[in-house]
């Protein structure tokens, strides 16, 4: 199983739940349906996971291979600065944003984009295989 604190990465684990994709040491869920940001977050939390928190450019580039033009919600919000749901600041990439009212973050194959949080979009959850300890 996975080791470490809530915000650690996972140790190498054998497999992921049904309909989840294993990539590196994490499991990723790419939704088929669309929800607003808060509902997407709730969906992930209910499955012992979290809305996608991207740790670095390498992970972002790898994930973008699986994305299209359609935007997906990720665990990124603007609360006096863009921060991931684990509390860390967005510092390895830029987010396209020039509106005060667009405070939730999304991703597509081209990069990060701010949006109004109530827009229904696809979403991406991330978790450790068969573990509820290390969410990110």
């Amino acid at each position: 199983l996975c080791q470490g604190s809530n915000y650690s990465t996972c140790a190498s684990c054998p497999s992921c739940p049904d309909r989840w994709m294993k990539y590196g040491n994490h499991c990723y869920y790419f939704s088929v349906e669309e929800k607003d940001w808060n509902s997407s977050l709730e969906f992930c939390l209910a499955r012992d996971s979290h809305l996608l928190v991207i740790t670095d450019n390498q992970e972002m580039s790898l994930l973008q291979v699986f994305l299209s033009e359609a935007f997906c919600w990720i665990g990124l919000r603007n609360n006096s600065g863009w921060r991931w749901e684990d509390g860390s600041p967005l510092n390895f990439s830029r987010i396209s944003s020039n509106s005060f009212v667009q405070t939730c973050g999304a991703i597509n194959k081209n990069g990060l984009q701010a949006s109004s949080c109530e827009v229904p979009l696809h979403w991406v959850c991330k978790k450790c295989p068969f573990a509820d300890q290390a969410l990110f």
Partner: antibody, heavy 125, light 112 residues
Framework: QVILKESGPGLVKPTQTLTLTCTFS??????????IGWIRQPPGKALEWLAH???????SYNSALKSRLTISKDTSKNQVVLTMTNMDPVDTATYYC?????????????????WGQGTTVTVSS | DILMTQSPLSLPVTPGEPASISCRSS???????????LEWYLQKPGQSPRLLIY???NRFSGVPDRFSGSGSGTDFTLKISRVEAEDVGVYYC?????????FGAGTKLELK
């Protein structure tokens, strides 16, 4: 810095077609969630929404004026154009463009954060 | 179309005193997503309108905290805790929850 600027003929004769252009900078109308709307204000009267267009070319019109209005965009020029046919003296107004934000409904919008200075249109023979 | 009714239409206020503007919608303007897209705009003399409040009670960037919005359903209020000379102009409420988006007739705030 977001800037919008309206331009138009100033004076239009009754029955003629009005063409208004909104030229903007500081953002792209290809960006997800961005839109531009047109709002008018007759002298001494309230504001009235006319039409808007989204980044994905979805459009919506004031139902009472729909048959007379056409909105389009030219993203390469950063412009949105509104045409209004069969102009009448009651269409005399200041016409504004404003940036609008998408919240999941293409037919309406919220948060007109940025407005142009407005262009005055007088309809008279 | 949803009718937005503002009152009063004219509001003389002494500088430093509070002011309150009411906006009533002809039907409930809670959107099916749970949000209420009720906004307040101020149009100063000779200027374009500018956004003050969005989604009922959220102050837009740079708007002084003497401005506050409240309400739900069909009844909404814009309050200015202490009116200043620069607050003079016409205040409009706006709803974007339902099609078509509509404005109120405006409330003209002037100094006594």
């Amino acid at each position: 810095q977001v800037i919008l600027k309206e331009s138009g003929p100033g004076l239009v004769k009754p029955t003629q077609t009005l063409t208004l252009t909104c030229t903007f900078s500081g953002f792209s109308l290809t960006t997800f969630g961005m839109g531009i709307g047109w709002i008018r204000q007759p002298p001494g009267k309230a504001l009235e929404w006319l039409a808007h267009i989204w980044w994905n070319d979805d459009k919506s019109y004031n139902s009472a004026l729909k048959s007379r209005l056409t909105i389009s965009k030219d993203t390469s020029k950063n412009q949105v154009v509104l045409t209004m046919t069969n102009m009448d003296p009651v269409d005399t107004a200041t016409y504004y463009c404003a940036r609008t934000i998408y919240y999941g409904n293409y037919l309406t919008f919220y948060a007109m954060e940025h407005w142009g200075q407005g262009t005055t249109v007088t309809v008279s023979s | 179309d949803i009718l937005m009714t503002q009152s009063p239409l004219s509001l003389p206020v002494t500088p430093g005193e509070p002011a309150s503007i009411s906006c009533r919608s002809s039907q409930n303007i809670v959107h099916s997503n749970g949000n209420t897209y009720l906004e307040w705009y101020l149009q100063k003399p000779g200027q374009s309108p500018r956004l003050l409040i969005y989604k009922v009670s959220n102050r837009f960037s740079g708007v002084p905290d003497r401005f506050s919005g409240s309400g739900s359903g069909t009844d909404f209020t814009l309050k200015i805790s202490r009116v200043e000379a620069e607050d003079v102009g016409v205040y409009y409420c706006f709803q974007g929850s339902h099609v078509p988006p509509t404005f109120g007739a405006g409330t003209k705030l002037e100094l006594k």
